[in-house]
Structure formats: C-alpha cells, structure tokens
Interface confidence: low
C-alpha cells in the first residue's frame, strides 16, 4: 500500500483526510493507529464513534481528533499542537469486527524550524489545503511552504 508523507510544523495542527469507497465501507467504524516499527503492530490512537450513524461526531484522544463523513467517504484526523514525538508511521483503518483494513499509510514528519519571512506568502495555501489521492493535509497557517510527497503508483 502506498505511503503518503506529510510534513507539519511543530506547535501547529496537521489534518489528514483518508478517502475510501463509501459503499464498500458502509457500516464500518474507522480508526487511526500508530505503527510500531516497520513490521510491528499498529497501536490504536483513536477511533470513530461506536454508533456508526454518529461517526460524524468528533472523537478525541489527547491531542488527536477523528471524525468520519460516511456519505462522502472521508475520515479526518487532526493532530493538534504537533510535537517532535508525533513523527512516525500511521494508518487510517476501516474496522470490520476484529479485523482492520488499511485505508492509507501516512508518514508524519515534524519540522522544528519556523519559515523565514522571505519564504512566506509566495504561494497561497488554502484553508482546506489538500494534497493527493488518498490523503490530504491542512495546516493551521497559510504561511507554510512545505512540500508534501504524493503516494507512489
């Protein structure tokens, strides 16, 4: 499965949106987990509401928030107040009983240094800034000039 690499600035918010086939995943809860090592297990961070019809409601675990638009087929995860320790490999998952289907693998990179003014503002970054097929990213500032890698084909 393709891995999308997303970069965010420390202290800011990073929003990831994983798209999926709404019909195929009808009735399934979604989860966001952190992979422990390349071949290790994926440790659950947060999952959507236990009642699927209420999946649109935001569920929070610490600084991580998840919400699922089941009609549009988009589950959104927001990592608030991004810290260096948040860097790592994550998965968006679709849950079916005890089984979990990986919707998207996301590598989160955390950048420590703020941008120089010289680099700011020469490229408009919309509020609903999106990246590439399968994963999107939003920043809490329009000053960010980072480049997101799209997935591989």
């Amino acid at each position: 499965l393709n891995t999308t690499v997303l970069q965010g600035m420390a202290g800011q918010s990073l929003r990831v949106s994983c798209t999926y086939d709404a019909l195929k995943h009808w009735g399934r809860r979604k989860a966001w987990c952190r992979q422990l090592g390349e071949e290790g297990p994926c440790q659950r961070v947060v999952s959507t509401h236990g009642v699927w019809l209420l999946a649109f409601l935001k569920k929070r675990n610490g600084s991580t928030v998840i919400a699922d638009d089941t009609l549009a087929g988009t589950v959104t995860i927001t990592l608030k107040n991004l810290q260096a320790g948040d860097a790592g490999l994550y998965q968006c998952q679709s849950l079916r009983g005890r089984e979990a289907e990986v919707l998207q693998k996301v590598l989160v990179e955390v950048l420590e240094d703020p941008l120089d003014d010289q680099d700011a503002g020469d490229l408009w970054v919309p509020e609903e800034s999106s990246s590439f097929e399968g994963a999107q990213v939003e920043h809490s500032t329009s000053r960010n000039q980072e480049t997101s890698f799209p997935p591989t084909s």
Epitope: L115, Q118, D119, E146
Partner: antibody
Framework: EVQLLESGGGLVQPGGSLRLSCAAS????????MSWVRQAPGKGLEWVSA????????YYADSVKGRFTISRDNSKNTLYLQMNSLRAEDTAVYYC???????????????WGQGTLVTVSS | DIVMTQSPDSLAVSLGERATINCKSS????????????LAWYQQKPGQPPKLLIY???TRESGVPDRFSGSGSGTDFTLTISSLQAEDVAVYYC?????????FGGGTKVEIK
C-alpha cells in the same frame, strides 16, 4: 535570490561511482523537499530522485533504484546524489531542483540549478 | 507509472502567431477532492535549465507572461502561446505532479517560421 549550484560531475567508467553535490542558498533549505532531474544529451527530462525537507523520506525512479542514493546535510545547505554502478545510459546533465513550496501544489520544480555533466564511458 | 505523451515533437510558428502544444497522460491527473489537475509546463531555452511556467494545468507561475496559458482536464492538456515572441523559442515539457514517480513528456521544440 534562490541559487542552486551543482558540482561533482565528470567522466567515469562503467561500473564506477560518482557523488554529486548541490549547494543551496537564498532560502531556508531544511524547509523544502529537493530533487534531482537528469537530461541525457539531446534528450528530454527524467526525474531521478527526491528527498523530504528533513531527509526522512526519499523516492527514486526505477531506473536508478538500488544504485543511487539521495541525501542532504541541512547544516551545510547541501543536497547530494551518490551514484554507484554507473552505466552508459546514466550519461546526462544532472540538475538539482527545489520542490516548489506548498502542500497542495505537490512536486513541481522551481528553480533549477545549471546542471553538472556526468559522462559514463570506457 | 503515468506516461506523458506530447505532440507535436516540433512546431514552427510565425512571430505574433499562436502556438499550441498538446500533452496527454496515460491516466487522469485530476484530483477530485479539490478539482485540480496536477499537470505542469516547463520552458527550456537552449543552454539553460528548465523554468516552471504553469502548474495545476492553468495556474501561471509568478512572472510568467500572460501570453502563456494552460488548459485541459483529466488526461488531455494544452499549452498555448497566444502571440509567439522571439524569446519564446525553446523546448516545452509537460509534467504530471500528481503521483510518484514524477514523469515528463518528451518535449516539444518551438521555432520561428
């Protein structure tokens, strides 16, 4: 003004190695992904490799995978391309390019360096 | 990989006339979530590195003259130079910036007739 200056090109025998460098200035180097793109004499452009701002993620074209390694030293504002097991078909001008800022735009290249010529021949 | 095919290979146009270059991708580069086409155009003048002209199929890079325009969606794209100037003599490349590996078209050489 953003400037990218490649060096390290030259003549090398098939099977040999070469390390290209790209010295960057005029922007916050560590905040931008960087890439190498090559152009064989009289031919078109071929993307070679890319690396994220932190150096934590890299991508390669299938034609160079396993032979070339992209890296960066953010403390020196320098991008590298280590080329091993060189072949005649690797002969090209190698350009260093900055990935244009902005998540939503994705990997477009601006600006480019002037390039350094790598010739693989016996 | 997405294969990018440009046509024609070369083009001779009179000064002040319109030049049209086509680019076709083997699969769609339209991202439905933001309705943007991830297709860029570059200009490479003799002895120089390429220069980014257009991204998102139709968004001109700052400083690029407005005689350069891009259009198209999905798999079929066009770069138009509305009134060819002597300084526009160059090779023009399309590039998909949608998915790795990044791929370029073979180039179109634009000359003055």
């Amino acid at each position: 003004e953003v400037q990218l200056l490649e060096s390290g090109g030259g003549l090398v025998q098939p099977g040999g190695s070469l390390r290209l460098s790209c010295a960057a200035s005029g922007f916050t180097f560590s905040n931008y992904a960087m890439s190498w793109v090559r152009q064989a004499p009289g031919k078109g452009l071929e993307w070679v490799s890319a690396i994220s701002g932190s150096g934590g993620s890299t991508y390669y074209a299938d034609s160079v995978k396993g032979r070339f390694t992209i890296s960066r030293d953010n403390s020196k504002n320098t991008l590298y391309l280590q080329m091993n097991s060189l072949r005649a078909e690797d002969t090209a001008v190698y350009y260093c390019a900055k990935l244009r800022g902005g998540y939503e735009v994705g990997p477009t290249f601006d600006p480019w360096g002037q390039g350094t010529l790598v010739t693989v021949s016996s | 990989d997405i294969v990018m095919t440009q046509s024609p290979d070369s083009l001779a146009v009179s000064l002040g006339e319109r030049a049209t270059i086509n680019c076709k991708s083997s699969q769609s580069v339209l991202y439905s979530s933001n309705n943007k086409n991830y297709l860029a155009w570059y200009q490479q003048k003799p002895g120089q590195p390429p220069k980014l002209l257009i991204y998102w199929a139709s968004t001109r890079e700052s400083g690029v003259p407005d005689r350069f325009s891009g259009s198209g969606s999905g798999t079929d794209f066009t770069l138009t130079i509305s009134s060819l100037q002597a300084e526009d003599v160059a090779v023009y490349y399309c590039q998909q910036h949608y998915i790795w590996p990044i791929t370029f078209g073979g180039g179109t050489k634009v000359e003055i007739k």
